[in-house]
């Protein structure tokens, strides 16, 4: 017993006078309390508690249910224990099987034995599996068996507690060991698509996926700069021990103008956070943007290739697309295709393949598309560059050389006159009239040019030449003239290519 | 004898929260998992959630997560459970139960919480 | 989660009959051979009492007319011979993962 000074309350003493008691099954627990100020007994087993008011604790047929610690209190709060053991061969254990771990803890096996005097107390496999090498244990007969620095790996473990009594060992009931994993991470997150576009009226439901060892991790969506609770649906899963999935589903069933914006999918556990967002757009109407990916005025020399292509937005998704020319539907000749795969994806691109345009080819091209809501149109203008072509070359009634030239761009028209048989006309003759004529063909055809000069200021034999010419190339035709006395004769023009 | 008391019956409003306590006594209150189990009226059991022992981890059901809190006061063996953003799904009876030998063993006798406008 | 599902809903009896509820879960409650599937009593405006515990063991104090069996996904709750205090709900519960779950109930009502 504790020894105490003089005047100050001093703890209750117990008879008997030992801390620990061993009785047999079905004989007499007599346990006196002495105190003044005696207060209560309390009975201790597997951390439930009983009390007695009396001073004498008496249980006539122990039980091994009675093994335990006797605490006797005063009314100073002072006490003193004793632990009786109810040696019962039938029953070596108390058991509480609940048995929890925390990742990196020490965690209790509560199985304290009725008998301090059996040996080799500790902890066995079932179905006489070993235990895990690293797997350390402190045996205590009167709590139980402290494993430590429990791991990941022992979840589902199945133990007894074991002992030998008179040479055999005895095993208890089965303790299935089940281990919260500490967390070593930040969840991981992810979403079903990174933006959605909807029109009003239609649902909008996006899933969150998050993925971390046990369920105890918190999630939830929440919306960008508002307080809002969002509805959420959760499915979840266990793939196998620390491998827990949830998907967290929101869904807004008639989405409105106004819940546009961002979404947020949080996740945190007692390591950290971890989001993801999605953003969501909601179009009162559908539309379809198109943006030409070359001018819309073209120029293409005769006989080369053009590309006309255009890349549109369209939501909701394009129904119809065609590329006309001179009320003349394309049946072929172009492609149509998204500009990606990604589900998500609202952008096209459409080709219109032009080749070995001619020169009666230019014109306005127009591609259309449609969907659901609206429909939309582009035009392109396309102006084929032609080398000018000599239409016609005429000495007229009246005197005049007349030389008309055809092309794209607007050819100029250039005169020389060559004396006698030289072959090089470098004297350059003034034009008299020059015209630009309206063209029978459509408007993005050729232009024409006439000029005119008067025949009556060449003197001498020789050569007249007309000179077409613009960007592409150039034509020249020749009048050839020779003088008989005083009368001049036109001999049958020609045209000569000069490239 | 393992005895759990809870607190009296509650009428809240919709949006508000409630905390209900649960006073254990009869057993070493650190060496427990402490579970909460609501009651829908005329509807079944449902398991809101655990607070462990020792360590006073928490594991809830995702169906309340970021709504409810359990926590423990070791200094008077008395365990609460709070929920807030009450809606009128929430009125129940609210169960405290004792995890003792792998089952719930002991049980609070039950607070009601209305919830109504 | 693990679902369990109760069969009856609801039943009508005798005293003196004997009566027979199952419980099916989604997924096995078995870890090595130890089922976490428990039997709960349920009267109305009281607590749930525990009848059986672990599938097959009698709580202490509950009489031994009522019984508990199965393994894995299939579980059992038989009263032999009913009494007049045996009219109740009946809950199944599992604890093998979280978040435990319980079963819809089995009303048993006097016939």
């Known amino acids: 017993q504790p020894s105490v000074s003089p005047g100050e309350p001093s703890p209750p003493s117990i008879h008997p006078g030992k801390s620990d008691l061993i009785v047999r099954v079905g004989d007499e627990i007599r346990l006196l309390c002495t105190d003044p100020g005696f207060v209560k007994w309390t009975f201790e087993i597997l951390d439930e508690t009983n009390e007695n008011k009396q001073n004498e604790w008496i249980t006539e047929k122990a039980e091994a249910t009675n093994t335990g610690k006797y605490t006797c209190t005063n009314k100073h709060g002072l006490s003193n224990s004793i632990y009786v053991f109810v040696r019962d061969p039938a029953k070596l254990f108390l058991v509480d099987r609940s048995l929890y771990g925390k990742e990196d803890n020490d965690t209790l096996v509560r199985c304290p034995l009725t008998d301090p005097e059996v040996t080799n107390y500790s902890l066995k496999g079932c179905q006489g599996k070993p235990l895990p090498k690293d797997l350390r244990f402190i045996p205590d007969p009167k709590a139980g068996i402290m494993i430590k620095s429990v791991k990941r790996a022992y979840h589902r473990l199945c133990l007894h507690c074991s002992v030998d009594q008179e040479g055999k060992s005895v095993l208890s009931e089965k303790f299935i060991l089940k281990v919260r994993p500490a967390f070593k991470a930040v969840p991981v997150v992810s979403v079903s698509k990174a933006s959605y576009l909807l029109r009003e009226g239609e649902e909008f439901t996006v899933t969150c996926t998050i993925k971390d060892v046990s369920s105890s991790v918190y999630s939830t969506w929440k919306r960008e700069n508002s307080q809002t609770k969002l509805q959420e649906k959760y499915n979840s899963w266990h793939h196998g021990d620390f491998n827990y999935e949830r998907q967290a589903t929101l869904t807004i069933s008639s989405a409105r103008v106004n819940d546009s914006g961002v979404f947020m999918c949080y996740a945190n556990n007692t390591f950290g956070s971890a989001n993801v967002t999605t953003t969501l757009e909601v179009v009162d109407k559908g539309f379809i943007n198109i943006f030409p990916m070359i001018n819309t005025t073209v120029f293409v020399n005769d006989g080369e290739n053009v590309d006309l292509i255009v890349e549109y937005e369209a939501f909701p998704k394009p129904e119809h697309q065609q590329w006309i020319y001179m009320n003349r539907t394309f049946t072929d000749k172009w492609e149509d295709y998204p500009k990606s795969e990604n589900e998500s994806n609202i952008r096209y691109v459409s080709e219109l393949h032009l080749t070995r345009l001619k020169g009666t080819e230019g014109g306005t091209y127009t591609f259309l598309v449609s969907n659901s809501d609206v429909n939309a149109a582009i035009a392109f203008n396309v102006y084929v560059n032609t080398k000018p072509e000599i239409l016609t070359y005429d000495r007229l009634v009246n005197g005049m050389l007349q030389c008309v030239a055809a092309g794209f761009p607007e050819p100029t028209i250039d005169w020389y006159f060559c004396p006698g048989t030289e072959q090089r006309c470098s004297a350059s003759v003034l034009p008299v009239d020059v015209q630009t004529l309206n063209s029978s063909g459509p408007p993005f055809g050729k232009l024409v040019v006439q000029s005119s000069i008067d025949s009556s200021a060449f003197k001498h034999n020789g050569t007249v030449e007309c000179k077409a010419y613009n960007d592409v190339g150039k034509t020249s035709a020749y009048f050839n003239f020779a003088f008989k006395g005083n009368n001049k004769e036109q001999i049958h023009p020609h045209t000569l290519f000069t490239p | 004898q393992v005895q759990l008391v809870q607190s009296g019956a509650e009428v809240k409003k919709p949006g508000a929260s409630v905390k209900v306590s649960c006073k254990a006594s009869?057993?070493?209150?650190?060496?427990?998992?402490m579970h909460w189990v609501r009651q829908a009226p005329g509807q079944g059991l449902e398991w809101m959630g655990v607070?462990?022992?020792?360590?006073?981890?928490?594991s809830y059901n995702q169906k309340f997560k970021g709504r409810v809190t359990m926590t423990t006061d070791t200094s008077t063996s008395t365990a609460y459970m709070e929920l807030r953003s009450l809606t009128s799904d929430d009125t129940a009876v609210y169960y405290c139960a004792r995890e003792r030998d792998t089952r719930f063993g002991n049980w609070g006798q039950g607070t009601l919480v209305t919830v109504s406008a | 989660e693990i679902v369990l599902t109760q069969s009856p809903s609801s039943l009508s009896a005798s005293v003196g009959d004997r009566v027979t509820i199952t419980c099916r879960a989604s997924?096995?409650?078995?870890?090595?051979?130890?089922?976490?599937m428990h039997w709960y009593q349920q009267k109305p405006g009281k607590a749930p009492k525990l009848l059986i515990y672990?599938?097959?063991n009698l709580e202490s104090g509950v009489p031994s007319r009522f019984s508990g069996s199965g393994s894995g996904t299939d579980f059992t709750l038989t009263i032999s011979s009913l009494q007049p205090e045996d009219f109740a709900t009946y809950y199944c519960?599992?604890?093998?993962?979280?978040?435990?779950?319980f079963g819809q109930g089995t009303k048993l009502e006097i016939k």
């Open positions: 672990l599938a097959s």
């Open positions: 997924e096995s409650v078995d870890i090595y051979g130890e089922s976490f």
């Open positions: 519960q599992q604890n093998n993962e979280e978040p435990y779950t």
């Open positions: 607070i462990y022992s020792g360590s006073g981890d928490t």
């Open positions: 009869g057993y070493t209150f650190t060496s427990y998992n």
